[in-house]
Amino acid sequence: KGEQISFRDCAEVFKSGHTTNGVYTLTLPNSTEEVKAYCDMEAGGGGWTIIQRREDGSVDFQRTWKEYKVGFGNPSGEYWLGNEFVSQLTNQQRYVLKIHLKDWEGNEAYSLYEHFYLSSEELNYRIHLKGLTGTAGKISSISQPGNDFSTKDADNDKCICKCSQMLTGGWWFDACGPSNLNGMYYPQRQNTNKFNGIKWYYWKGSGYSLKGTTMMIRPAGF
């Protein structure tokens, strides 16, 4: 019986010759745990592991700590890959993070961080980011230095309020901060003056809830 080939991320999938967009099974080294992830094999040279996507409001993102830990949704549509997998993956080698955004007027923009990793669960999956470039703002809409992750049942933010309950969705809230890509999905013409929408302040300003978001990672130097 041949040895089972496993891939830790979409970059490995790409390098193995699978260069078609789609859902692939990923496994961390020294682990039997499998996750299904969407691989973007076309954008910017391919090899991108999608860790978050919003596109139509079909999936509820107001989830528990455990759900954000293991992931939820549909990898072909709206989903969250899972904080535990992303934490382990991004601590094994250096990864870049690209955040692709769409507004309701047909515009697109991105933020690219040259180094991204999540701390362990013991450290509340704190986000670490370095080296911002891109078209979605010269200032990072993810507060710097990075914050701990918060969910509706795990309040780790810096606010006297509970940001995840107030804004909906799990995120690296500050108090509450300039972004929340896991906020409430609002349809076109109902997407302004929103206190709890899908927010990326340094591109679209306050209260604007975006049409689509994708967070994707790839090893640095791919």
Partner: nanobody, 129 residues
């Protein structure tokens, strides 16, 4: 639907007065802070004053202290900005904006600009002789 509508702007001579109004709908002032901001041509938007109706707390930028007074009438769901001793440098479009009152960092009193998620369309104030 959350809406903020400013009114009361206009042309006034230096040393004169104006009262701006910000009428809120879709939420009650009790649970929110309202800020007044202004933006002069070619300049960044800047905070002028803010109020938390629930606690009666107020904030003023140094440039308007002693000249501007912010107040609220919760029965009318309206916030006012009384502007006295107006100067040419006060010329700008004035906006009101809202933020949930609880969205405060531990140990701080007021809110960064990016926390104000609901905005009005603005009212123009021109101070000129």
């Amino acid at each position: 639907e959350v809406q903020l509508v400013e009114s009361g702007g206009g042309l006034v001579q230096p040393g004169g007065s104006l009262r701006l109004s910000c009428a809120a709908s879709g939420f009650t002032l009790d649970d929110y802070a309202i800020g007044w901001f202004r933006q002069a041509p070619g300049k960044e938007r800047e905070g002028v004053s803010a109020i938390r109706s629930s606690g009666g707390s107020t904030y003023y930028a140094d440039s308007v202290k002693g000249r501007f007074t912010i107040s609220s009438d919760n029965s009318k769901n309206t916030v006012y900005l009384q502007m006295n001793s107006l100067r040419p440098e006060d010329t700008a479009v004035y906006y009101c904006a809202a933020v949930p009152a609880g969205r405060l960092r531990f140990g701080e009193q007021w809110y960064p600009l990016y926390e104000y998620d609901a905005w009005g369309q603005g009212t123009l104030v021109t101070v000129s002789s």
